[in-house]
């Protein structure tokens, strides 16, 4: 294992995670560890000199940066709150407050919204979409021949009972919010009033 700074033929250092090629001196030099930055660039005779990031700044990775990134607070106006503080080697970790969920744009959580568990009223059901989410439910009426009799975010419309399949007759027709009511057929020979 070569100790930086060292010269190399093909500009590819042995440990690319922790070393980098410095073209000005044609040598491989040490990167600075997380939490530090380059205070003095390496030369042919001296390796990189690193220093700890100043207060309220950080570098997350092995680097050869001349500065540290400024810590950014979590934006409480957008519904975020810090779950872990910014340290010299890690930016602040932000998360939506409990009871709030992320609104995503290009795979990034851009702001938080109150979770609204929409209740679909009797006669309607939640529209099925590809997204498996409890928020922003769109309620649609039951199809003809179907009913749904609860206020629920997940209940599905069910087909009306077909009385004849059970050997019964219809006493009251089904609606979008109630099932068909069936009754026993009249006895043979019974007098119809």
């Amino acid at each position: 294992q070569l100790v930086p700074p060292y010269r190399i033929e093909n500009q590819t250092c042995w440990d690319q995670d922790k070393e980098y090629y410095e073209p000005m001196h044609d040598v491989c030099c040490s990167r600075c560890p997380p939490g530090e930055f380059v205070f003095a660039v390496c030369s042919r005779s001296q390796d990189t000199v690193c220093k700890t990031c100043p207060h309220n700044s950080y570098n997350e990775h092995w680097n050869h940066l001349s500065t540290c990134q400024l810590c950014r607070p979590c934006d409480i106006v957008l519904g975020f709150e810090e779950v872990a503080p910014c340290t010299s080697d890690r930016k602040a970790e932000c998360r939506c407050q409990p009871g709030m969920s992320c609104v995503y744009l290009d795979n990034e959580c851009v702001h938080c919204e109150e979770e609204r568990l929409v209740l679909c009223q009797p006669g309607t059901e939640a529209e099925v979409t590809d997204e498996i989410m409890d928020t922003d439910v769109n309620c649609v009426p039951c199809k003809p021949g179907h009913f749904q009799n609860t206020s629920s975010p997940r209940a599905r419309c069910q087909p009306h009972t077909r009385c004849e399949i059970q050997g019964l007759v219809e006493a009251a027709p089904g609606t979008s919010y109630s099932d068909t009511i069936c009754k026993n057929p009249p006895e043979p020979g019974a007098m119809l009033l």
């Epitope: 810090e82 872990a84 009871g99």
Partner: antibody, heavy 115, light 107 residues
Framework: EVQLVESGGGLVQPGGSLRLSCAAS????????MNWVRQAPGKGLEWVSG????????YYTDSVKGRFTISRDNAKNTLDLQMTSLRAEDAAIYIC????????WGQGTMVTVSS | DIQMTQSPSSLSASVGDRVTITCRAS??????LAWFQQKPGKAPKRLIF???SLDSGVPSRFSGSGSGTDFTLTISSLQPEDFATYYC?????????FGGGTKVEMK
């Protein structure tokens, strides 16, 4: 350095009242949900109440709803818990905690409910 | 309310052992879970947040995993200072809830 210092605990009779306070320093108080967590002797941790950063939303565990009131003063960096109609089962160490993920904790103040 | 069920409630182990504690949520909580260590007479100390992120200054022998309803805290090689009680906590929704705790004792 984050510091949370609770005060106001003590001995109170059943049905009595007590006001706990938590003085916070070392962080931007107004940016964090603040919570009270309690621990009865020899028992586990129980979240009691929380208040949103701006103080506009408050949350309580079912057993204290209507009896306890949480409040905060962002100008003074203080968190309070007004406890009324105290019961024997409320006796515990009450600890102030920073953030909804409880990043930092105080040392707690003891509340004893006994006749 | 979201119930957090921790197991085992206690365990005996020796220095150097690999220790695993599990926590199950009664409904999905994404990764909104923290693990805490508490020693007698002391305030709890957070070890892990967001299910798997290690808090600053916490030894790397501690690790967390899981998402949804099932979560695990692992101590890869138990040290003398690790004998304590461990709690999980969900912060997906109010009321915030803790597991019942796992006491790690010396075998």
């Amino acid at each position: 350095e984050v510091q949370l210092v609770e005060s106001g605990g003590g001995l109170v009779q059943p049905g009595g009242s007590l006001r706990l306070s938590c003085a916070a320093s070392g962080f931007t108080f107004s940016s964090y949900t603040m919570n009270w967590v309690r621990q009865a002797p020899g028992k586990g941790l129980e979240w009691v109440s929380g208040v949103a950063p701006s103080g506009d939303r408050t949350y309580y565990t079912d057993s204290v709803k209507g009896r306890f009131t949480i409040s905060r003063d962002n100008a003074k960096n203080t968190l309070d818990l007004q406890m009324t109609s105290l019961r024997a089962e409320d006796a515990a160490i009450y600890i102030c905690a920073q953030g909804f993920a409880f990043t930092n904790w105080g040392q707690g103040t003891m509340v004893t409910v006994s006749s | 309310d979201i119930q957090m069920t921790q197991s085992p409630s206690s365990l005996s182990a020796s220095v150097g052992d690999r220790v695993t504690i599990t926590c199950r949520a009664s409904q999905g909580i994404s990764s909104a879970l923290a693990w805490f260590q508490q020693k007698p007479g002391k305030a709890p100390k957070r070890l892990i947040f967001d299910a798997s992120s290690l808090d600053s200054g916490v030894p790397s022998r501690f690790s967390g995993s899981g998402s949804g309803t099932d979560f695990t805290l692992t101590i890869s090689s138990l040290q003398p200072e690790d004998f304590a009680t461990y709690y999980c906590q969900q912060y997906n929704n109010y009321p915030l809830t803790f597991g019942g705790g796992t006491k790690v004792e010396m075998k």
